[in-house]
């Protein structure tokens, strides 16, 4: 028997992945767990192994499908399970009627790349990765530029309150070298969440003219 | 095998109310979603609305404006399907069917007659 | 609501034909796209889901392809007992919604 409060939290990148963690205080050694999800309305179900990622948490990533392909509805309800083997049998450790479109947390933005830089701007262009048609254009984002002799966390955030894949950084300093990060996230789901970062994209400010003001 | 069987024709005059069954074998009947859906004649199909009959949950066709009721007896696996305030239009066949990616199983259907 | 416009909505053909119908969504509803066959006074029954899957039991001679808006059902050789009205749906929202049918006849 296993004792202590447990966790169950997943969440859906709107297309083919669900991905979950689970913890448990009372923390189970050396036994076998899985995710089991079981969609009201379609034929597929899947599994995946919970994996350790700290002393009481585990994770995994229930893959429903080619990365592209729209496996679930704004409809659809998803019963997970967390099954630990118990001897020859599987325990339920944990279970949730999911709602995989009001639990969205999508992939990072990718392929950011510098468009256009100068002395004191630079606008910058990435893509959305693995979205659903469901989003048209109900998505947000999140932006941060990291200068010189600060850290992430200090960095401000901009927003952009619309499907918006470009930014252009103003005020930025001549022959400098900065670090520029991307988030997205549905405006739908009411436990929907913020993507991870993207990569960071660095790039350097052009110099500014010989004899000229700055 | 999964068989839908459903209730027999009704007649019904304008403002009454029609309560339609399908009767569920061969699966388990609390784990899928049964719909109904209408055949008028002359119209296209139309998608009514459906229940999951191991939690009570519902959706509906806003088009029926709170005249379709859909409801289940799960210890006799049938669902139920009332449709009140009648009017000549809603002169149709009903079918109720499982849904699991697509309706795979339909019911014989359900001729309901209203008419003064 | 999505608007589901099947075409054509009749037509006749040879046994042994290929025969092409085609479905077209009013926005873009994935892969959720189904198909079915009634025959004059029987209930309907599925063939296709999800686009291109062969419900149990339907013989393989039945196909369906496409994606996002526009979508394709297929009989590659048609067989006497085909005669019936096809119809296209989508689960890709509430309200589902069908096609208006389309009336295979043989020559």
């Known amino acids: 028997a296993v004792n202590g409060t447990s966790q169950f939290t997943c969440f859906y990148n709107s297309r083919a992945n669900i991905s979950c963690v689970w913890s448990q205080d009372g923390a189970l050694q050396d036994t076998s767990c899985q995710v089991h999800a079981w969609p009201d309305r379609r034929r597929w179900n899947q599994t995946c192994e919970l994996l350790p990622v700290s002393q009481a948490s585990w994770a995994c990533n229930l893959i429903l499908g080619a990365p592209d392909s729209q496996k679930l509805t704004t409809v659809d309800i998803v019963t997970l399970r967390v099954l630990c083997r118990e001897g020859v049998r599987w325990r339920v450790m944990a279970i949730q009627d999911f709602k995989p479109f009001e639990n969205l947390r999508l992939m990072a933005p990718i392929s950011l790349q510098v468009v256009h830089v100068e002395t004191h701007r630079c606008n910058i262009s990435w893509e959305i990765s693995q979205a659903s048609h469901y989003f048209e254009r109900h998505l947000e984002f999140e932006a941060r530029t990291l200068s010189p002799g600060h850290t992430w966390e200090e960095a401000p955030l901009l927003t952009l309150k619309q499907k918006q894949e470009w930014i252009c950084l103003e005020t930025l300093t001549p022959d400098t070298q900065y670090e520029f990060q991307v988030r997205v996230k549905p405006l739908q789901g009411e436990f929907t969440t913020w993507s991870p970062w993207s990569q960071p994209l660095a790039f350097r400010t052009k110099p500014a003219a010989l004899g000229k003001d700055t | 095998q999964v068989q839908l069987v459903q209730s027999g024709a009704e007649v019904k005059k304008p403002g009454a109310s029609v309560k339609v069954s399908c009767k569920a074998s061969?699966?388990?009947?609390?784990?899928?979603?049964i719909t109904w859906v209408r055949q008028a004649p002359g119209q296209r199909l139309e998608w009514m609305g459906d229940i999951y009959p191991g939690s009570g949950n519902t959706n509906y066709n806003e088009k029926f404006q709170g005249r379709v009721t859909i409801t289940v007896d799960t210890s006799a696996s049938t669902a139920y399907m009332e449709l009140s305030s009648l009017r000549s239009e809603d002169t149709a066949v009903y079918y109720c069917?499982?849904?699991?990616?697509?309706?795979?199983?339909w019911g014989q259907g359900t001729l309901v007659t209203v008419s003064s | 609501d999505i608007q589901m416009t099947q075409s054509p909505s009749s037509l006749s053909a040879s046994v042994g034909d290929r025969v092409t119908i085609t479905c077209q969504a009013s926005q873009d509803i994935s892969n959720f796209l189904n198909w079915y066959q009634q025959k004059p006074g029987k209930t309907l029954k599925l063939l296709i889901y999800y686009t291109s899957g062969l419900h149990t039991g339907v013989p393989s001679r039945f196909s369906g392809s496409g994606s996002g808006t526009d979508f394709t059902f297929t009989i590659s050789s048609l067989q006497p007992e085909d005669i019936a009205t096809y119809y296209c749906?989508?689960?890709?929202?509430?309200?589902?919604?069908f096609g208006q049918g389309t009336k295979l006849e043989i020559k």
């Open positions: 069917a499982r849904e699991r990616g697509g309706f795979d199983y």
């Open positions: 749906q989508q689960d890709n929202n509430h309200p589902y919604t």
């Open positions: 061969g699966y388990t009947f609390t784990s899928h979603w």
